[in-house]
């Protein structure tokens, strides 16, 4: 038996993956334990199994088929069961009924580019992954730009409120080492969170031209 | 939908080993919960052993526990059983499973199966 505050979290990515993580208080030490997902209109069902992340909680990936496959609608609720084994019979516990369009969070985004660099500017692309079609352009993007002697968490947010899927970084310092990333989030879903932060994409500006004010 | 194919079955003696492969296409592997069955001549198709998505959990039917070992290579696309310390009556068509619900695995009617391996134990 498990004792202990327990909490169970899932989230679309849109196409057909629901990433779960479950923290538990009570220690379950070798315990085996799934997450266990009931469509209400569809006739598949899936299964993932739970592995630890860190010493109370676990995760698991509900792939639910091709990276690029739509599984789930707006009107789709999925029931998701964390079970674990007892001996050899199943006990529920956590579960919840999941609004998948409710709980968002997207793959981060991918391929960021630099397509032009000068002394004190760059512009930067980059493309969204795995993000369904029914967004249409209801979008917005978070980049974060990390200057030489600062964190990321002291880099500045920039918003982009729209599907914008490219930036143009002003003041930059001419001859200087940048790194730059991005994230995304749907505007629908009262629990949608953000994106991961894309892979870090480093650049450079270019030197100040010898015997002229930059 | 996913697609399955069994190799490595054959005549072996009785306390010999065999290792069966499962090569799996078609669809995102890591998606499956895999397992092998077996049936012999006569009988009913039967649950030998499955291993979870990410191998990390396995079960067995009591008759092959200590002997036999089911395991995946995620980056392969195959389930492995292997065989050991044969038995005669473990001769059998061997077939390998897969079931996106792990709860359903053993439930015959529920999976996705290959075409079978036979394996031969002599006495």
């Known amino acids: 038996a498990v004792n202990g505050t327990s909490q169970f979290t899932c989230f679309y990515n849109s196409r057909a993956n629901i990433s779960c993580v479950w923290s538990q208080d009570g220690a379950l030490q070798d315990t085996s334990c799934q997450v266990h997902a009931w469509p209400d209109r569809r006739r598949w069902n899936q299964t993932c199994e739970l592995l630890p992340v860190s010493q109370a909680s676990w995760a698991c990936n509900l792939i639910l088929g091709a990276p690029d496959s739509q599984k789930l609608t707006t009107v789709d609720i999925v029931t998701l069961r964390v079970l674990c084994r007892e001996g050899v019979r199943w006990r529920v516990m956590a579960i919840q009924d999941f609004k998948p369009f409710e709980n968002l969070r997207l793959m981060a985004p991918i391929s960021l580019q630099v397509v032009h660099v000068e002394t004190h500017r760059c512009n930067i692309s980059w493309e969204i992954s795995q993000a369904s079609h029914y967004f249409e352009r209801h979008l917005e993007f978070e980049a974060r730009t990390l200057s030489p002697g600062h964190t990321w968490e002291e880099a500045p947010l920039l918003t982009l409120k729209q599907k914008q899927e490219w930036i143009c970084l002003e003041t930059l310092t001419p001859d200087t080492q940048y790194e730059f990333q991005v994230r995304v989030k749907p505007l629908q879903g009262e629990f949608t969170t953000w994106s991961p932060w894309s892979q870090p994409l480093a650049f450079r500006t270019k030197p100040a031209a010898l015997g002229k004010d930059t | 939908e996913v697609q399955l194919v069994e190799s490595g079955g054959g005549l072996v003696q009785a306390g010999g080993s065999l290792r069966l492969s499962c090569a799996a296409s078609g669809d995102v592997f890591v998606r499956y919960t895999m397992a092998w069955f077996r049936q012999a001549p006569g009988k009913e198709r039967e649950f030998v052993a499955s291993v979870t998505d990410s191998g990390r959990t396995t079960d067995y039917v009591d008759s092959v526990k200590g002997r036999f070992t089911v395991s995946r290579d995620n980056a392969k696309n195959t389930v492995y059983l292997q065989m050991n310390n044969l038995k005669p009556e473990d001769t059998a068509v061997y077939y390998c499973?897969?079931?996106?619900?792990?709860?359903?695995?053993?439930?015959?009617?529920?999976?996705?199966w290959g075409q079978g391996t036979q394996v031969t134990v002599s006495p």
């Open positions: 499973a897969a079931n996106t619900d792990y709860f359903q695995i053993k439930s015959l009617d529920r999976n996705t």
